[in-house]
Interface confidence: medium
């Protein structure tokens, strides 16, 4: 009879006995309870250090649970953001293999001499995108000044041009009020181009490790006093009270476990965040494309190289009028000019056919196919979460035997307290356990500030802004009206807000800088700029 | 495991109609919470209507009085009649599932807070 199964300890002495309890501990039959913290003080199989130590074993096993159950999330991401964060790289690298082959193919040996400029931008693109590097605009801007230096002494091989006037002519171009523009469009679109792809996926990265970090933190719970006792009376008692075959009321369990992770859920920046990937990885497969991106930074210094040459006599006239004429090379000294094949290469146009593909192809789209079908699983994770507990063997019955009588937490029936949902709200009227009314606790609210700021981050990445300081969508010549040009990006973009204007000559790299930088007056004579 | 599969979304000019359904694959549904949640192009999660096992029914106030809830629990379905549809209702529709019995009656069935989603259905309200 029911009775007789109810007055045995025998299956609970086999159970623990299973899992390492002293046999001693545990009584053949049940015995008085009034010496139990959590259990129902009647009939039992415990004694007091064996109810202490199942309420040790019943938190392990919650906080187990919930590891496991999350752990997809942490490898997912961390997945996720290991294979973003090799192809970004490895796409820059395929861009400056290509360009080394485009521009040793169009320029040759004059290339081969100069080329640690362009490796110097690839180096420092790179820095930027891991972070340590400085700002796009100041990096991009060095770039085209030394470009300048190198190649415009090369227009003019009958002339000296010493480093202070080569000095004078890299501020000259990078001077905030435009007037000399050698390169002509191609350093802004470059700029704009390079600036929205690489703040879009620095901002991506960020978020996919921002959210691995969070996620695997959110997961190791801390358990409260009301908690464990919840969870003590949810898996432990029926042990105690010799029925350990008897599984938990799946309700009983969902309010237990809800209550339990009341203040540790993300949402709703959970979901918002799983939104601000999506929209940044279409971005970053659409208008913002990577290797679009990656493909052109090649043709965009090519053009511009092809605007110095068919302005030439413009540019040149303006440089001799801010930097004085320079001095002729005495005829002995001269250069020979180089071969005449190799100079009409020079300055040769990149075509078409010429523009570099890469291996990767369809890689983007793949793995943006492959992140949409797994953040799909990823929503709906922390509502979700309970269910999941629940579902384990250990923590409740099968919720299809609902029918079926189970561990109500004082006996054998069926649970009828409502089962309340995980929202503070809800949680205030949890019937087993008297949940903190007053929301997330502070671990919990820090890491959903983190979310959002990582979300806001990628979301405004994909508006073609930087949080982190310049905004990718803005006019870099300081000169115009913004506009925005269809084959950067999408026609019809609305015109960027106005910027405050760079410091007219930034230090370079090299340390020098300011106005004047010793040089002789000779170089900076013309129209005064106030620095 | 619960599985949620909507129907019915589709292109209807501005002041026509159309019915949401959602079937649920789990015969306890009936003591769950449900409600449709949308999200219009580039914007975030927005819940517009709830129910729960107690019978009480919410809405956002931008849908009160044109759309109405309701459930059928002998065919395990939840339904959403939308009737004067505005282009501003435009967005994907989801069907939601929690397994807490009184979200409306806690107020807080609006709260993206539920277990199961179904994976959405589109509604066009376009001239």
């Known amino acids: 009879s029911e009775a007789k199964v109810t007055r045995s300890c025998a299956e609970t002495r086999q159970v623990l006995g299973a899992r390492g309890y002293s046999l001693n501990l545990i009584p053949p039959a049940l015995i008085s309870g009034e010496h139990l913290r959590v259990c129902p003080q009647e009939y039992t199989c415990c004694s007091s250090e064996t109810e202490q130590r199942l309420i040790r074993e019943t938190e392990a096993t919650f906080r187990g649970l919930v590891e496991d159950s999350g752990s997809f999330l942490v490898h997912t991401l961390a997945a996720r953001h290991r294979k973003f964060d090799e192809f970004f790289l490895e796409m820059l690298s395929v861009a400056q293999h290509s360009l080394t082959q485009l521009f040793s193919h169009s320029y040759g040996r004059l290339y081969a001499q100069h080329a640690l400029i362009f490796n110097g931008l690839f180096s420092r693109l790179r820095d930027f995108y891991g972070e340590s590097g400085e700002g796009l605009d100041d990096t991009l801007a060095d770039f085209w000044a030394q470009l300048l230096e190198r190649v415009f002494p090369l227009l003019h091989p009958q002339y000296s041009f010493p480093p202070d006037y080569l000095l004078c002519l890299s501020r000259l171009a990078s001077s905030t009020d435009g007037s000399l523009q050698p390169f002509g469009d191609s350093p802004r679109r470059l700029r704009l181009q390079i600036t929205r792809t690489l703040v879009a996926a620095r901002a991506f990265v960020q978020g996919l490790e921002t959210g691995r970090n969070v996620v695997s933190e959110a997961l190791k719970v801390p358990v409260s006093e009301g908690c464990s006792q919840a969870l003590m009376r949810l898996i432990g008692c029926p042990l105690c009270r010799g029925v350990p075959s008897l599984m938990p009321c799946q309700g009983f369990c969902l309010n237990v476990v809800r209550g339990c992770l009341s203040s540790r859920g993300l949402e709703p920046d959970w979901g918002n965040y799983l939104d601000g990937l999506l929209i940044l990885a279409d971005k970053l497969q659409g208008p913002f494309s990577f290797e679009l991106t990656a493909e052109s930074i090649g043709v965009k210094i090519s053009e511009g190289l092809m605007y110095l040459q068919e302005n030439s006599a413009k540019v040149s006239a303006q440089v001799f009028q801010e930097c004085g004429p320079p001095d002729p090379v005495p005829a002995r000294n001269r250069r020979a000019p180089p071969p005449r094949e190799e100079a009409g290469r020079l300055w040769s146009m990149v075509t078409e056919e010429e523009r570099p593909t890469t291996a990767a192809g369809t890689n983007l789209h793949r793995l943006v196919w492959e992140l949409r079908e797994r953040l799909a699983r990823m929503r709906g994770f922390w509502a979700r979460l309970s269910l999941t507990v629940c579902g384990d063997s250990r923590m409740a019955a099968d919720a299809s035997l609902e029918a079926a009588p189970c561990w109500t937490g004082a006996g054998r029936g069926r649970y009828l307290p409502p089962v309340v949902g995980g929202s503070p709200a809800e949680q205030v009227n949890n019937p087993e356990l008297k949940v903190d009314a007053s929301g997330p606790d502070v671990p919990t609210r820090r890491r959903r500030l983190q979310l959002r700021a990582a979300t806001a981050r990628m979301k405004t990445a994909a508006l073609g802004h930087d949080l982190d300081g310049q905004d990718a969508d803005e006019d870099a010549s300081g000169s115009g009206g913004g506009q925005q040009y269809a084959d950067d990006w999408m026609a019809g973009a609305v015109a960027p807000p106005a910027r405050p204007p760079r410091p007219p000559y930034p230090p370079r790299r090299d340390g020098s800088g300011g106005k004047g930088g010793g040089g002789s007056a000779r170089y900076n004579q013309g129209r005064s700029r106030s620095g | 495991e619960v599985q949620l599969v909507e129907s019915g979304g589709g292109l209807v000019q501005p002041g026509g109609s159309l019915r949401l359904s959602c079937i649920v694959s789990r015969y306890t549904y009936a003591t769950y919470s449900m409600a449709w949640f949308r999200q219009a192009p580039g914007k975030g999660l927005e819940g517009v209507s709830g129910?729960?096992?107690?019978?009480?029914?919410g809405y956002a106030e931008s849908v009160k009085g044109r759309f109405t809830i309701s459930r059928d629990n002998s065919k395990n379905t939840l339904y959403l009649q939308m009737n004067s549809l505005r282009a501003e209702d435009t967005a994907v529709y989801y069907c939601?599932?929690?397994?807490?019995?009184?979200?409306?009656?806690?107020?807080?069935?609006?709260?993206?807070?539920?277990?199961?989603w179904g994976q959405g259905t589109l509604v066009t309200v376009s001239s």
């Open positions: 129910l729960d096992s107690v019978g009480a029914t």
């Open positions: 939601v599932v929690d397994p807490a019995s009184a979200k409306v009656t806690y107020g807080s069935w609006s709260t993206p807070s539920y277990a199961y």
